[in-house]
């Protein structure tokens, strides 16, 4: 599977006005990534995975460049012509990909109420369009518009091109993604407690992404919640992450206890050692 | 009607440049698409050199970048092939091509690379 | 760069037969980037199936394309005489643009 990053940006206009603000969503490796709300864009993590690697430089950039690319598919959206009453919605789906033999591609896709009517290969400029008539007259008038206004701001396609996979190189760089999936190491730990007590403990490490499922059972049965203890899953600064669940049990009955992993589709059974 | 006629010299000396023109009638190459160099070495298959699209963009093929350039006169509706420092293995026929899915091409034209 | 490799090098086949050739890419192709040409001796290649299976204008029904991501195919469902060529196809996903080695269509 190839590294991708892609930014999903949503417009809306109401009875032919274009509404302010805009939704944004970026997606790294297929995970959520960041997404900016509806009427002030401000970059957010999507979750600790995010936040812990990336620092505020990348949600500042990345806040700006959204706010930026926002306004543009606005302007577009003002410039579709015979817009009907009621709610619409123009939606830019930008992707970059970095393939195992280290070729690239990129792309960008406009829906115009959830239906698709223009393409452009990014990286060699090339547009296809559906064969329906009525995406054929949106894509003709988006453009020409478009091809227009990259006159004036003398930017062009190969420059967004070569933006996001200059962004997914740094995510990539940054160790915030290392693979689709990384299987943990599982290992299983005793220490004494109290008399006749000892508290056996369940580490996982190296995995990614950060989803996993810990959890100690005694006879095949899952013990309740208050009865263990989990750690937070933390990066472990290799780009992939650790955790840990302990419990304390009687002295004797270890052969009755094991540690569940599930991770990505796949689980283990993990017993403490004699 | 779409068509497209490369012209330049049949012969050029070795280390010297070789210089190609496409011109192009029946379609402005401003409007649309990528307008391509490909050559084919005697009795081997197609290789792609570079293109310059409807907006300017030039792309190359790595592996003759540092001595390709393409460039283009909208006035005259032409494209042209620069290749420097040329040797044997530059002899070939060179065609001209629209789009990306090359649906025009030129008749070509021989190129040989002999002192 | 992609990689295109055509299979057979070389096909020999009696009029009326079904041509099958392959071509095959070292990374994944969007099919809508992906073209068959078909170049008879002394002649400029020409257009022969766009965005893996589209006619192009002119071409004989009788040819026809399909595939997706790595594994391409064109097909001549009844060879007639005039098939003779060298069939190459090509990938525009990425740069650089290239084209497979070709394979050589003979009539018996």
């Known amino acids: 599977e190839p590294h991708s990053l892609r930014y999903n940006l949503t417009v809306l206009s109401w009875d032919g006005s274009v509404q302010s603000g805009f939704l944004a969503e970026v997606h790294l490796d297929g995970q959520p990534f960041l997404r900016c709300d509806r009427q002030k864009c401000r970059a957010k993590p999507q979750g600790q995975w995010a936040e812990d690697v990336l620092g505020n430089k990348t949600w500042d950039r990345e806040t700006r460049d959204l706010t930026g690319n926002g306004k543009d598919l606005r302007m577009t959206l003002a410039h579709i012509k015979d817009q009907k009453e009621g709610l619409h919605s123009l939606q830019e789906i930008r992707v970059c990909e970095i393939h195992e033999d280290n070729s690239t591609r990129s792309s960008q896709h406009f829906y115009y109420d959830g239906e698709l009517f223009l393409s452009q290969n990014l990286e060699t400029e090339e547009w296809t369009m559906p064969q329906s008539s009525r995406a054929q007259t949106l894509a003709m008038n988006v453009r020409n518009f478009l091809k227009e206004d990259a006159m004036k701001t003398k930017t062009h396609y190969h420059a967004m091109h070569a933006d996001c996979l200059q962004e997914l190189r740094r995510y990539l760089k940054s160790g915030v993604v290392l693979r689709r999936t990384v299987p943990p190491m599982v290992n299983v730990t005793r220490s004494e407690a109290s008399e006749g007590n000892i508290t056996v403990t369940c580490r996982a490490s190296g995995f990614y992404p950060w989803n996993i499922t810990l959890s100690w059972r005694q006879d095949g049965v899952s013990l309740s919640h208050d009865t263990q203890q989990w750690g937070d899953v933390l990066p472990d600064g290799n780009g992939t992450y650790q955790t840990w669940v302990a419990t304390r049990i009687c002295q004797g009955e270890e052969q009755r206890f094991t540690c569940y992993m599930e991770h990505s589709g796949n689980h283990s059974t993990h017993p403490v050692p004699s | 009607q779409v068509q497209l006629q490369e012209s330049g010299p049949g012969l050029v000396k070795p280390s010297e440049t070789l210089s190609l023109t496409c011109t192009v009638s029946?379609?402005?190459?401003?409007?649309?698409?990528?307008w391509n160099w490909i050559r084919q070495p005697p009795g081997k298959g197609l290789e792609w050199i570079g293109f310059?699209?409807?907006?300017?963009?030039?792309k190359y093929n790595p592996s003759l970048k540092s001595r390709v350039t393409i460039s283009r006169d909208t006035s005259k509706n032409q494209f042209s092939l620069k290749l420097s420092s040329v040797t044997a293995a530059d002899t070939a026929v060179y065609y001209c091509?629209?789009?990306?899915?090359?649906?025009?091409w030129g008749q070509g034209t021989t190129v040989t690379v002999s002192s | 760069e992609i990689v295109l490799t055509q299979s057979p090098a070389t096909l020999s086949l009696s009029p009326g037969e079904r041509a099958t050739l392959s071509c095959s890419a070292t990374?994944?192709?969007?099919?809508?980037?992906f073209h068959w040409y078909q170049q008879k001796p002394g002649q400029a290649p020409r257009l022969l199936i766009y965005?893996?299976?589209n006619l192009a204008s002119g071409i004989p029904a009788r040819f026809s394309g399909s595939g997706s991501g790595t594994d391409y195919t064109l097909t001549i469902s009844s060879l007639e005489p005039e098939d003779v060529a060298v069939y190459y196809c090509?990938?525009?996903?990425?740069?650089?643009?290239?084209f497979g080695q070709g394979t050589k269509l003979e009539i018996k």
């Open positions: 091509a629209r789009g990306y899915g090359f649906d025009y």
């Open positions: 029946g379609y402005s190459i401003t409007s649309d698409y990528a």
């Open positions: 310059v699209s409807y907006s300017g963009t030039t």
């Open positions: 990374s994944s192709i969007s099919s809508i980037y």
């Open positions: 965005r893996t299976s």
């Open positions: 090509q990938q525009g996903t990425t740069i650089p643009f290239t």
